[in-house]
Amino acid sequence: LMGGQDKPFLSARPSTVVPRGGHVALQCHYRRGFNNFMLYKEDRSHVPIFHGRIFQESFIMGPVTPAHAGTYRCRGSRPHSLTGWSAPSNPLVIMVTGNHRKPSLLAHPGPLLKSGETVILQCWSDVMFEHFFLHREGISEDPSRLVGQIHDGVSKANFSIGPLMPVLAGTYRCYGSVPHSPYQLSAPSDPLDIVITGLYEKPSLSAQPGPTVQAGENVTLSCSSWSSYDIYHLSREGEAHERRLRAVPKVNRTFQADFPLGPATHGGTYRCFGSFRALPCVWSNSSDPLLVSVTGNPSSSWPSPTEPSSKSGICRHLH
């Protein structure tokens, strides 16, 4: 991770991808410590911020503008050398987002995947982006970059993620950049949560008063397990969103969540999953599917008594 004998290591916290108007801390690690350092921008634009100044431990940059985008290096203080400074560090690319219209991000075959599978994240736009970047929230490494393919007035790139492991689960966003400004990125796509299932034992799913009910009768689906899951997720076949509830410890030492579906109007096949607060995007095996049948007069859909979660937000904690 660190540089060579006389080469500092330059890093960015929280990320090298910085929204326009945001802040980022640049750290120059030299000889097992954070000492005084100088900072350079390779294209020599926007140099007034450095102006021969010496920084201590870290440099807080911001609020950033498109002019901040580019490649940076640092030199660590080396008092007894000829120049007083180390060799230049590794190059660090700072990308500034929010400069063009956001692209779209889709998952194929879908955002809910089994451990070991591969997912294709497709980033596309009607803006003719030369490059697309894919970034996972909370990661300080550089985003993945692909050249955009232009077809029928649409530019796109397919990022292959896999085989999926818990470390790859999370919230993804993609960005585009136009020619001649490779580090001035677009606004982020809407976030896309990639969820990995099949890591823990399956919960059980049951219906009260039962899986076959009269139209208009109130139905509650209960998801429970001996495992101390923090959150349960309930999905219905054919619906994009899932519902989630905090698990409640019961006297029989199980952990349970009760999903009220309201008055029964329409049947469907339901599954539930458990997850832990520390890894909100890593879910258990699916419960056995539960077919809820409604006798009487079914209408076109089941009203949602609780606000369904959006396609994103799964990977956030429930407060």
Epitope: R13, P48, R53, E57, I60, M61, G62, T65
Partner: antibody, heavy 118, light 107 residues
Framework: QIQLVQSGSELKKPGASVKVSCKAS????????MQWVQKTPGKGLEWIGW????????KYAEDFKGRFAFSLDTSASTAYLQISSLKAEDTAVYFC???????????WGQGTSVTVSS | DIVMTQSPSFLSASVGDRVTITCKAS??????VAWYQQKPGQPPKLLIY???TRHTGVPDRFSGSGSGTDYTLTISSVQAEDVAVYYC?????????FGGGTKVEIK
């Protein structure tokens, strides 16, 4: 949204100390710094200095070295300004403002009035 | 220390007027100039930084320009809600220093 909330007004006697707090919310506290600015009717806005919330390293303007001290409680996303051995000329409104090494102060606290009088 | 001399210290304008405030630095500050607006009873608010970059949510009637030692804040069509004191600040070298302020009133 980004907010900086400062502690309330203070009335102090000369020679006493005062500690002004500035609680930040709406952003990751350690990715920016906290600047401190004094406003007096006579001198207008004057920069006291700033503290790097990532490294904890403070920097003071020459005129404010000695009796003025910055500190942080990163777990509470709070920055502090302590003024010791207060003098009548320290009577002012003190502002905290988010900012870094580039000196741009993009969000400000509401200000804390400190009055030093016997 | 770099001294920022702001002028005028007071101006009165009618709604819709174009208003210009200038700031002169005692040395070249290489476009590292910010402008703030302070309304009565409120803290200062960032309008512009790096001479011409508008801060998030700032109406586009506010613009900045300049280079070297001379900088300008322009309000293209002043509104009643723009009544405030405006300050320039150099963010080129520490200690960061502010201008004395320009009080803008509406006739």
């Amino acid at each position: 949204q980004i907010q900086l909330v400062q502690s309330g007004s203070e009335l102090k006697k000369p020679g006493a100390s005062v500690k002004v707090s500035c609680k930040a919310s709406g952003y990751t506290f350690t990715t920016a710094g906290m600047q401190w600015v004094q406003k007096t009717p006579g001198k207008g806005l004057e920069w006291i200095g700033w503290i790097n919330s990532h490294s904890g390293v403070p920097k003071y303007a020459e005129d404010f070295k000695g009796r003025f001290a910055f500190s942080l409680d990163t777990s509470a996303s709070t920055a502090y300004l302590q003024i010791s051995s207060l003098k009548a000329e320290d009577t002012a409104v003190y502002f905290c403002a988010r900012g870094g090494d580039e000196g741009v102060m993009d969000y400000w606290g509401q200000g804390t009035s400190v009055t030093v009088s016997s | 220390d770099i001294v920022m001399t702001q002028s005028p210290s007071f101006l009165s304008a009618s709604v819709g007027d174009r208003v210009t405030i200038t700031c002169k630095a005692s040395q070249d500050v290489s476009t590292a100039v910010a402008w703030y607006q302070q309304k009565p009873g409120q803290p200062p608010k960032l309008l512009i930084y790096w001479t011409s970059t508008r801060h998030t949510g700032v109406p586009d009637r506010f613009s900045g320009s300049g280079s070297g030692t001379d900088y300008t804040l322009t309000i293209s069509s002043v509104q009643a809600e723009d009544v405030a004191v405006y300050y320039c600040q150099q963010h080129y070298s520490t200690p960061w220093t502010f201008g004395g302020g320009t009080k803008v009133e509406i006739k």
